[in-house]
């Protein structure tokens, strides 16, 4: 499989799985934009939620995870057309009867306010002004994220945790 | 969300989304092991296939994509218990009536030989000796991958392709 746009490009050397030499500067790839400590890719084309998840994954990234209202607002400010919607990494877990981020954490009640049904096959998208649920099979744009963390050169393994 | 294991660690600077300063050395993160030009993470816990896909994605990686029989053998050689199975990034696409990798390519007939049903909600796992299909809702361990590509220092955006 050819690496897709947005890989971390590196020089291969053997026998270095546990060393911790790290670069002190890494930029967002072409087509991605830096927003605070993340690189975001706003897709132009559309996909069902599952395909969007897979697309971000094969780009070695994640569907957008939103930490708080400030991050939601920052992201929404980058959406320049109020008619456009983007899948994020949040869907309804039927077994747990709760909204669940793809990293396994549950939506906390004071985070996003979701308009729409909380039921099986419901996934969450954001627009310029709101957060909605919709059937996961609906085709929409999506947002992938890569997190950037602050380090300089030699770092302890804790930087990976 | 706290950055999960396996992020690209960087020094944040603004206004540099299109520059292409790249590190010339990047190692597999702690807990990951280098196998040829990939870093692999063998999970310890278990998950349904969809959750495994999501987990790899939030680690900014992909469920394992296997290019050929050699890579399959190399990966299986790392499985030290014949009773343990790992989800990979391959499932059955009902609409396309074919086994499909999560990067969108179809399983070629001379690649892996899958034992088990090719039907809706069938996902693929590997063991020490074989490749099987199973209901995607079954909880199993899984393997995430990050690809490493060869570059040195200043590079053109082509290194991202």
């Amino acid at each position: 499989q050819k690496p897709s746009i947005g890989k971390c490009s590196v020089d291969i050397q053997q026998n270095r799985t546990k060393t911790t030499e790290r670069p002190d500067l890494l930029n967002c790839p072409i087509y991605w934009q830096q927003v605070q400590e993340k690189c975001l890719l706003f897709s132009h084309t559309v996909n069902p939620w599952n395909n969007s998840l897979a697309d971000c994954s094969t780009k070695e990234s994640s569907l957008l995870l939103i930490q708080d209202k400030d991050e939601l607002t920052r992201t929404q400010n980058l959406i320049h057309d109020k008619a456009i919607s983007f899948w994020i990494g949040l869907n309804f877990s039927l077994s747990e009867k709760n909204w669940k981020w793809i990293n396994g954490s549950f939506l906390s009640s004071n985070d996003l306010k979701i308009t729409g049904d909380a039921k099986e096959n419901s996934c969450v998208y954001i627009s310029q002004t709101s957060v909605y649920s919709e059937y996961c099979s609906t085709e929409m744009k999506w947002i992938c994220q890569k997190e950037l963390t602050l380090v300089r050169n030699k770092v302890s393994p804790d930087s990976w945790l | 969300q706290k950055p999960s294991i396996g992020k690209c660690s960087v020094d944040i600077q603004q206004n540099r989304t299109k520059t292409t300063e790249r590190p010339d050395l990047l190692n597999c993160p702690i807990y990951w092991q280098q196998v040829q030009e990939k870093c692999l993470l063998f999970s310890h816990t278990v998950n349904p296939w969809n959750n495994s896909l999501a987990d790899c994605s939030t680690k900014e990686s992909s469920l394992l994509l296997i290019q050929d029989k050699d890579e399959l053998t190399r990966t299986q050689n790392l499985i030290h218990d014949k009773a343990i199975s790992f989800w990979i990034g391959l499932n059955f696409s009902l609409s396309e009536k074919n086994w499909k990798w999560i990067n969108g390519s179809f399983l070629s007939s001379n690649d892996l030989k899958i034992t088990g049903d090719a039907k809706e909600n069938s996902c693929v796992y590997i063991s020490q000796t074989s490749v099987y299909s199973e209901y995607c809702s079954t909880e199993m361990k899984w393997i995430c991958q990050k690809e490493l590509t060869l570059v040195r220092n200043k590079v053109s955006p082509d290194s991202w392709l």
Partner: antibody, heavy 121, light 107 residues
Framework: EVQLLESGGGLVQPGGSLRLSCAAS????????MSWVRQAPGKGLEWVSA????????YYADSVKGRFTISRDNSKNTLYLQMNSLRAEDTAVYYC??????????????WGRGTLVTVSS | DIQMTQSPSSVSASVGDRVTITCRAS??????LAWYQQKPGKAPKLLIY???SLQSGVPSRFSGSGSGTDFTLTISSLQPEDFATYYC?????????FGGGTKVEIK
């Protein structure tokens, strides 16, 4: 080999129909939105239509809206363009094109060789 | 729809010359611009994407610049194989639109 191969072009009378096909190989066809682009003899490039990777969303240039239908069969790695009510001004070489990245509609890094459609009585 | 205006429509130049082609969008498109080269009887070939990124395999004598509404394709030292027609294309919004083309001819 990574390639796109169009077929189905030919001579057709005004008001007639043709169905173009584009067979893809060597890449993960089902993850890419795909487009048709045409070029009238001696003229420039004109985007005609696009379809999402899963096939549920389609777009058309105003000049062909209501007459052309784009579709795809991901199980066959094939893109189609059904052209009805053809006019003389639809005469062109028709190319299918793949975008550089699976998140994009455009920036076409792979083109077919093209198939010529001639509309004439 | 976003209109893309290319200039000049044709240019005569010699091998070794520096050639500059401009493309103007009728509204801002950030850096969502690509450049293609087309030779007679052949399909277009992607040269530049995202306004300034060189496509894999394209010689470094080709470069792109600009953002917003004004963009430039530069061939630093024209080679015999560069005589062709060049098109810009915006990828900011649908419908995708192309410039009218610039034919680079031998002087």
């Amino acid at each position: 080999e990574v390639q796109l191969l169009e077929s189905g072009g030919g001579l057709v009378q005004p008001g007639g129909s043709l169905r173009l096909s584009c067979a893809a190989s060597g890449f993960a066809f089902s993850t890419y939105a795909m487009s048709w682009v045409r070029q009238a003899p001696g003229k420039g490039l004109e985007w005609v239509s696009a379809i999402s990777a899963a096939g549920g969303t389609t777009y058309y240039a105003d000049s062909v809206k209501g007459r052309f239908t784009i579709s795809r069969d991901n199980s066959k790695n094939t893109l189609y363009l059904q052209m009805n009510s053809l006019r003389a001004e639809d005469t062109a070489v028709y190319y299918c094109a793949k975008p550089l990245d699976s998140s994009l509609w455009a920036d076409f890094d792979l083109w077919g060789r093209g198939t010529l459609v001639t509309v004439s009585s | 729809d976003i209109q893309m205006t290319q200039s000049p429509s044709s240019v005569s130049a010699s091998v070794g010359d520096r050639v500059t082609i401009t493309c103007r969008a009728s509204q801002g498109i950030d850096s969502w611009l690509a450049w293609y080269q087309q030779k007679p009887g052949k399909a277009p070939k992607l040269l530049i994407y995202a306004a300034s990124s060189l496509q894999s395999g394209v010689p470094s004598r080709f470069s792109g610049s600009g953002s917003g509404t004004d963009f430039t394709l530069t061939i630093s030292s024209l080679q015999p194989e560069d005589f062709a027609t060049y098109y810009c294309q915006q990828a900011s919004v649908l419908p995708i639109t192309f410039g009218g083309g610039t034919k680079v001819e031998i002087k």
